[in-house]
Interface confidence: medium
């Protein structure tokens, strides 16, 4: 390391602490250090060391307490299955390297559940699910032996228990003891054995957290059975009079640091957005803590179910708020949650027993004051009458999720706090805040939400097409005439919406190239559908050389688009998707959407332009109030329109107008931007309100966008609210739910 002999602010020298094959970084102002190894390697024998009061670093001790002279990075191996009941696995080996595969086979009479083939992953964990060979003879199905664990107990009758153990030096995550319950499910959650270097990958966390959260939020119809071999999902019939409280608890102690604190806030903002996308309106409680907790939002506040307002409160929290008292008192923080849950005078309000509570705790590790927080979890369980009645344990009414961030996380502590539910994971350990941010971006992006319109992946690692996943590039090759470039927007799995003027009637489908998601390959086109009223020559006799009314077209693709992080649809007006995106009630009408998106005023909007091979968002204002008339009148400065007596001859009610210098100097569109979407960005979602059609001034002569443009440089866009009948007709099979 470049600073190997520098002295940290603590009192331990850095001489001789280097790790072979890796590096180290100081934590907690020099009071601890973390060894960092390349991907696929782990620090041996320990990942972290602490600076002792004697001025020396904690000893390098192996799991069997042998002292090692120098730390080194060793290749990560995955554990071998200690036992596999009622079947075999191949190949057998004392350990497995990253990317090794093992596969499982059941003896005759037994059926395989889980993953038949599993691969050793770079984080030292096996891919897939625990393989289990079961003959269905027990009251409960065989709970399995997760790789690396040992199971005691092989009777699966009602009330039988099994216990799990880990080898020395590994920490058990999940339930050590599981009991066969009424209904054939096992209590608790599947255990696993964790080494200190093991982290959950963002993808694993996103999937596991989301599937558990979805169970909590969505509520599955109680009549639904479960297929053979499936674990029974927990079933909650959402009582219309029931409700949900989500408590966000954020560690703001010294060791977190300002940038991590900001990262954690971003994660929670994404979480709020995600929950809102399900159409539920929970009440939020918001607590940050260090030595003492600070309640920012109480669930009892009127606005606590207003996602936008809660997000605003969250964004306004400052890391400095805990600066002077910077211990880590998790117990006090959970007591603050308890205080929000409890009711005045101990008189439970009507419906208390129908409210479900979700606690989401983000911490970087060790509580160092205030005592064991698990006692508060026990008090909360008591308060909510959970686990007291065997016939109705009410476990579904409390979910505690714990996100441990970084190397100092005490796995035993966070596991103790988290809920343990069959087939669900409530405790997560991620490498760093960047990984946690990844989790919440991926979570917003899970397959269920891939079809959600107007969603973007606003991540620090995101590419242009992560940020504009609807954007399509269109080019038309015309032999001997060069080619025309346009933009478009993905509106469904089969359609791209663009401008009609990008094409001529002579253009053949094979000469039209469409690409999405930044991909090099072009999509095959089935047909281009023009608006029937579009006719560029429609007013030639009246001396109007080009007439752009109804300048919209839909490109129908031959093959269905595969949605992903860089390809997904934009929202269209007057669809159910837009109702949900704007968080409006399901009964919202098309007119109400119009009032929300295009009120009679200057409306902040944006379009996407390509500059030097990069997509950039350009902020403009749609003149829809008192500036609308003057905006439209400037059309007379367009080439060929100078002789037009009545400007409404060319600027029909189908157009929206942007550009000019008031209220702000708007950037202008260029030729290649034609057909692209004019977008309103609301509640973190993107709704297309127009299609870029034509401009008064060509501000992009010689491929360069001019900085100084005249005040009359205006742009005109087809207003999608004005072509809805046509959109509705052509997109009727696309499941967009037009209102």
């Amino acid at each position: 390391t470049p600073w190997s002999l520098a002295r940290p602010q603590g009192s331990c020298s850095l001489e001789g602490v280097e790790i072979k094959g890796g590096s180290f970084r100081l934590l907690q102002e020099g009071q601890a250090l973390e060894y960092v190894c390349p991907s696929g390697f782990y620090p041996y024998p320990v990942q972290t060391r602490t600076c002792r009061s004697t001025g020396s670093w904690s000893t390098l001790k192996t799991q069997d307490q042998k002292t090692v002279r120098k730390a080194e990075c060793r290749a990560i191996h995955c554990p071998r299955p200690h036992d596999f009941e009622n079947g075999e696995y191949w190949p057998r080996s004392p350990y497995y390297n990253v990317s090794d595969e093992i596969s499982f086979h059941c003896y005759d009479g037994y059926t395989l559940r889980g993953s038949a083939n599993r691969t050793c992953q770079v984080n030292g964990r096996w891919s897939g699910q625990t393989a289990i060979c079961d003959n269905g003879a027990g009251y409960c199905s065989n709970p399995g032996i997760p790789i690396g664990t040992r199971k005691v107990g092989s009777q699966y009758r009602l009330e039988d228990s099994v216990t799990y153990h880990c080898s020395r030096g590994l920490t058990l995550r999940g339930s050590q003891r599981r009991t066969c319950q009424e209904g054939g499910s096992w209590s608790g959650t599947e255990p696993s054995c964790q080494d200190s270097f093991m982290y959950d990958t963002p993808q694993e966390v996103a999937e596991a957290f989301l599937s558990s959260l979805t169970e909590t939020i969505e509520g599955v119809d109680a009549e639904d059975g479960h297929g053979p071999g499936e674990q029974q999902k927990r079933k909650i019939v959402l009582d219309p009079s029931g409700s949900m409280n989500i408590y966000l608890v954020l560690d703001g102690s010294d060791s977190i640091g300002a940038s991590n604190f900001t990262g954690a806030k971003k994660c929670l903002v994404n979480l709020i957005e995600k929950v809102a996308s399900y159409g539920v309106k929970p009440r939020y409680g918001l607590v940050t803590y260090a030595t003492y907790p600070k309640i920012w939002v109480k669930v009892s506040e009127a606005d606590s179910s207003n996602a936008d307002w809660v997000t605003k409160q969250l964004n306004e929290i400052n890391y400095e708020d805990h600066k002077l008292k910077s211990g880590t008192n998790t117990k006090k923080a959970l007591q603050a949650v308890y205080s929000m849950m409890s009711w005045p005078d101990d008189v439970p309000p009507e419906g208390w027993n129908r409210t479900r509570h979700v606690i989401i705790l983000m911490t970087d590790g060790l509580h160092n004051m205030g005592g064991d927080p698990i006692t508060v979890i026990d008090e909360i369980r008591d308060l909510l009458y959970i686990g007291k009645d065997r016939k109705n344990p009410r476990e579904d009414y409390l979910d505690v999720y714990v996100f441990g961030v970084g190397p100092l996380v005490n796995q035993v502590n966070i596991n103790a706090l988290a809920s343990k539910k069959d087939n669900e994971q409530h405790v997560f350990k991620v490498k760093d805040m960047e990984n946690l941010e990844d989790v919440f971006y991926q979570m917003i992006d899970e397959s269920q939400s891939l079809s959600l319109c107007g969603m973007v992946w606003e991540h620090r690692k995101g590419t242009d097409y992560h940020k504009q996943p609807w954007q399509a590039k269109i080019s038309v090759i015309r032999p001997s005439k060069g080619h025309e470039s346009c933009m478009g927007a993905v509106v469904s799995e089969y359609f791209v919406l663009t401008a009609a003027h990008c094409f001529t009637v002579d253009d053949k489908e094979h000469s039209i190239k469409v690409s999405v998601g930044g991909e090099k390959r072009d999509l095959e086109i089935e047909v281009v559908l023009f608006h029937p009223n579009y006719n560029i020559n429609g007013k030639k006799e009246a001396g109007i050389p080009e007439f752009y009314d109804y300048d919209v077209a839909l490109i129908k693709l031959k093959n269905k688009l595969k949605y992903g992080q860089t390809i997904r649809p934009i929202c269209l007006p007057c669809t159910e998707g837009t109702t949900r995106a704007l968080r409006l009630p399901p009964t919202t009408t098309c007119q109400q959407q119009k009032e929300e998106l295009l009120p009679a005023q200057d409306i902040k909007a944006l379009f996407v332009s390509e500059e030097e091979k990069k997509l950039t968002r350009k902020e403009v204002y749609i003149k829809n109030g008192d500036k609308k008339g003057s905006c439209e009148r400037d059309a007379q400065y367009a080439p060929g329109y100078d002789k037009v007596k009545d400007i409404s001859e060319v600027v029909t009610p189908r157009f929206l107008c942007t550009g000019g210098v008031s209220p702000y100097a708007d950037p202008n569109t260029c030729r290649g931007d034609s057909g692209g979407p004019l977008i309103v960005h609301k509640r973190s979602r993107f709704i297309q309100v127009g299609v870029i059609s034509w401009g008064v001034v060509d501000v992009c002569k010689n491929q360069k966008r001019q900085k100084q443009v005249p005040a009359h440089a205006r742009d005109f866009h087809i207003n999608l609210f004005q072509v809805l009948p046509w959109l509705k007709e052509k997109l009727q099979d696309e499941d967009l739910g037009f209102l």
Epitope: F84, E85, W90, P91, R92, E101, S103
Partner: antibody, heavy 120, light 113 residues
């Protein structure tokens, strides 16, 4: 009836590569691991590695790591074993073999063998 | 790697007599949780690929005559042919699949005396 048919004998110079094919029929090719075993003249059997035709996942014996590549073409139900940087002691009969069930290590079905001779 | 050592290297037995081939592994092939031994026996006749005779140390492959039997556990295993027939002349190999890499014994050549 399960059949594994291998390509014909090959003569190679030291330093060259050889690619032996094994065409499977009579069962679903992607459902069963394919293993390769070799036998030098008058010598015993030596396990080289296996391929999971479904995923393309491979496992090679340490001895051959870096020189052997096992691939498959599921469209024609054929597995391939390529050995590079050939030496004279690579002269052997190379067998493909398949287990009883998906990933069995008991080789119930064998190809007829392909003799590879490495000689300058 | 697990080393498999067969004895004897060659063996001559009269027709109708018992033939015994031994195989010793350098570490136990017994998996305690399943009580199974990860060992197989193969027969190879000249110019042919090997043929599976026995797996799990003692389970006879279907179609294999019952004069062939396997026994043993842990590190010591035996293949027995109770009454030698002329068609049994071949080289016999033991193989372990307890750990990777899977390894074979050096082979035992069985001839008629």
């Amino acid at each position: 009836e399960v059949q594994l048919v291998q390509s014909g004998a090959e003569v190679k110079k030291p330093g060259a590569s050889v690619k032996v094919s094994c065409k499977a029929s009579g069962y679903s090719f992607t459902d069963y691991y394919m293993t390769w075993v070799r036998q030098a003249p008058g010598q015993g059997l030596e396990w080289m590695g296996w391929i999971n035709p479904n995923s393309g996942g491979t496992k090679y014996a340490q001895k051959f790591q870096g020189r052997v590549t096992m691939t498959r073409d599921t469209s024609i139900s054929t597995a391939y074993m390529e050995l590079s940087r050939l030496r004279s002691d690579d002269t052997a009969v190379y067998y493909c073999a398949r287990g009883y069930y998906a990933n069995s290590a008991w080789f119930a079905y064998w190809g007829q063998g392909t003799l590879v001779t490495v000689s300058s | 790697d697990i080393v498999m050592t067969q004895s004897p290297d060659s063996l001559a037995v009269s027709l109708g007599e018992r033939a015994t081939i031994n195989c010793k592994s350098s570490q136990s092939l017994l998996q305690s949780s399943t009580s199974k031994n990860y060992l197989a026996w193969y027969q190879q006749k000249p110019g042919q690929p090997p043929k599976l005779l026995i797996y799990w140390a003692s389970t006879r492959e279907s179609g294999v005559p019952d004069r062939f039997s396997g026994s043993g556990s842990g590190t010591d295993f035996t293949l027995t042919i109770s009454s030698l027939q002329a068609e049994d002349v071949a080289v016999y190999y033991c193989k372990q699949v307890y750990n990777l890499p899977w390894t074979f014994g050096q082979g035992t050549k069985l001839e008629i005396k």
